[in-house]
């Protein structure tokens, strides 16, 4: 064996292990004939704390008193320096600074399951910074004792490896943990318990759910438990919810009926177990069971609205629209909608099932009284039908809401306000606010939106399917029995100047004046509701200011006459469009020379 300290020794007094704040004496001494050759009195012994010089002395030994060492381990090394040579390593020693163990606190023991083993945990208290040994002792009836030791540096858990059995569930057991290191020892307070106190059942397993006759109202949850379980608690919630419903049951024997589940809803179920009413602890929650409850027939009624469009003297187009039922009303997957159209006087009726749409369009005669009924069907049945009599919604002028306005209200919202109709306002049963994107040409494929408002309301905030920089045609209907009156307005939630001006596509001469025709600005370039068009003209090659004519915007209008041009003068014409935010850039320029006679 190589002697690392063949030249000398480092000794530490009172011990290599000291209490924080203590002083230690370190001595470095050379062995005989190990000093500097020929120059023994020139021996220079140097003490290093790790690699930092802290003391030196000429001679055969060096004594150093060291204080203020930090918690943990510090390495001291002694070296010999001779003239004209490198320092020679003599010896080294470690000093361990720590504290005595604190009393272990909160000792608690548990046995996981009836077949599990007893394991205990405790709080060590502050770190000792020293090797500390923990001994856990368990004593039981008939002077039985078990002991387990732990030499891990951070020991706060030990498993005895023994199984407590339920033969005598009221027998007392006592556990105690003792911590020992070089500076002292300390024991926890004893913890006394019975089998029932410390056995924590295994979580229930094999969880299943059954719905008798595929009905949500006849639902039973089944599970398996350890033999001695007396109590269970169940928790369940819809998968999209954070709040649990909680049920406590006694002597359930692995089954429980649930009475308050909603149909067609995915639920998460968990179960926990306990051996005794007031002793011991609950098991962990079981693994989740996820299951969907069966469908039930829909409740509630569809919100139905309609639009009429004149086709010719004998026919009209009816477009029906309805909103989806809420999930809680649908109570299942809606398979189809049933639409029944009936002529009330003649009794003729036609029924159609609509799948994949929430609208239906048909053509009916303009004569007769017509009614529709719409219901939603799932695998279990149909909702109550919503019945509507088809009438001329805007026929009663005296029922028309007054002073309708539409103003932007924050991002993608429009506030619609109105005044009640002149006719007895108390006759109004409800208002309907309807909106759809404004499309020149009145495209009937554009989706229709509506909301219903109580008769005492004179405003509604519309936000569904509202986009920035789009103009909406908004109608407010006042309904009273089989009569209706309406008013309309254009509105947008956000606007800016149009991106382009109208494109002049033709200029024609008519009896000394001209007719200008143009193409509408594409909807995506209008940037809100158009208020006006402007037609500009000036003589070609002239530097004078152009003249202009401002025309209020009307959806269907795309031509306008001008009669102030001089014959046989060539003019340049162009157009712009305006929203409330400003004027567009010029559209295309066209030249025109009026051929007619001078006045």
């Amino acid at each position: 064996k190589i002697d690392a300290c063949k030249r000398g020794d480092v000794t530490v007094k009172p011990s290599h292990v000291i209490l924080l704040g203590s002083t230690v004496n370190i001595t470095c001494s050379l062995k005989p004939r190990q000093g500097c050759f020929h120059y023994s009195r020139r021996n220079k012994l140097i003490l290093y704390k790790f690699d930092r010089r802290i003391n030196f002395h000429h001679g055969h030994s060096l004594n150093s008193q060291v204080t203020g060492l930090p918690l943990g381990t510090t390495l001291f090394v002694c070296k010999l320096a001779c003239i004209n040579s490198d320092e020679i390593q003599i010896c080294g020693a470690e000093i361990f600074v720590g504290v005595a163990p604190e009393q272990p606190q909160n000792l608690s023991c548990i046995q996981k399951g009836e077949q599990g083993t007893v394991a205990c945990t405790w709080e060590r208290g502050r770190d000792t910074h020293l090797y500390t040994e923990y001994t856990l002792q368990l004593s039981g009836p008939k002077n039985l004792t078990w002991q387990k030791q732990c030499k891990d540096i951070y020991c706060d858990y030990l498993d005895f490896g023994i199984n407590l059995t339920p033969e005598s569930p009221e027998s007392n057991f006592t556990a105690k943990v003792t911590a020992v290191n070089s500076l002292g020892s300390s024991s926890s307070l004893p913890s006394t318990f019975t089998f029932l106190d410390i056995v924590r059942p295994l979580p229930p397993w094999d969880i299943r759910i059954k719905f008798q006759k595929a009905s949500v109202s006849r639902c039973t949850l089944y599970w398996r438990d350890e033999g001695l379980v007396l109590l269970n608690r169940l928790r369940y919630r819809p998968s999209n919810s954070r709040l649990w419903n909680m049920v406590n049951v006694t002597k359930a024997k692995g089954r429980h009926d649930l009475l308050d589940l909603k149909p067609f809803t995915e639920y998460e179920f968990q179960i926990s177990s306990k051996l005794h009413l007031y002793k011991g602890s609950w098991s962990d929650w079981s693994e989740s069971l996820r299951a969907q409850t069966p469908e039930e027939e829909p409740t509630g009624m569809l919100d139905v609205w309609y639009m009429k469009r004149h086709i010719d003297y004998s026919r009209q187009q009816i477009s029906l629209f309805w909103k989806n039922l809420s999930v809680s009303e649908a109570r299942g997957k809606i398979l189809h909608y049933q639409v029944t159209l009936q002529e009330l006087t003649g009794g003729k009726a036609m029924t159609q099932n609509i799948t994949g749409h929430t609208s239906w369009t048909t053509v009916i005669p303009r004569t007769g009284n017509w009614a529709v009924a719409v219901s939603a069907a799932n695998s279990k049945g149909s909702s109550l039908p919503t019945r509507i009599n088809i009438m001329n919604l805007c026929e009663a002028g005296l029922l028309a809401p007054r002073q309708v306005s539409a103003n932007s209200e924050g991002m993608d919202n429009i506030l619609v306000t109105w005044q009640p109709p002149r006719k007895d306002p108390s006759a109004v049963q409800e208002y309907v606010v309807e909106w759809r994107e404004l499309h020149p040409g009145g495209d009937t494929q554009v989706p229709l939106n509506w909301l219903r408002s109580r008769p005492y309301n004179v405003s509604a905030l519309i936000s569904e399917n509202i986009k920035s920089y789009i103009c909406y045609e908004i109608r407010v209907y006042a309904l009273s029995g089989d009569q209706g009156g309406c008013s309309s307005i254009l509105g947008n939630s956000k606007h800016k100047a149009p991106l382009s001006g109208p494109h002049i596509n033709a200029i024609t001469e008519e009896k000394g004046s001209i007719l200008i025709s143009w193409n509408s600005i594409p909807v995506q370039e209008q940037m809100g509701c158009l208020l006006h068009y402007r037609i500009y003209w000036k003589e070609r090659d002239s530097n004078s200011q152009p003249q202009l004519c401002e025309i209020p915007y009307r959806v269907s209008q795309n031509s306008h006459p001008i009669n102030s041009l001089q014959p046989r003068v060539t003019y340049v014409l162009w157009m712009t469009a305006l929203t409330a935010a400003g004027e567009s850039s010029h559209g295309n320029e066209r030249e025109f020379c009026l051929q007619g006679k001078a006045n």
Epitope: F50, D51, G72, T73, L75, Q89, G92, A93
Partner: nanobody, 125 residues
Amino acid sequence: QVQLVESGGGLVQPGGSLRLSCAASGFTFEPYDMSWFRQAPGKGPEWVSAIDKGGGAGATYYADSVKGRFTISRDNAKKTLYLQMKSLKPEDTAVYYCAITAGPYSDSTPRVAYRGEGTQVTVEP
């Protein structure tokens, strides 16, 4: 008493391999960084490699001259430091010794607290 004892040196041909060991005793080992140094005849000590305190997954550092050829490791349970040397060259000939050190290891020679006596490695055809 603190002790570091190197072993595993010997004579090897160029391109060959050796594995050096350093057995520690008399101190706790685990809380310290450890390094390998070498000293060729007539030259000063040269730092070769280091490994951080703690487990075998401690960070490792190498001198440019040995990067990719030498691998340092430690086994705290056995209180042993290792240096696996591959693709040895004649210029690797030196006495190799282990030491208790402290960083940094990137751009300066590490601080040395205690070193072993060393083991001779000779690389020649």
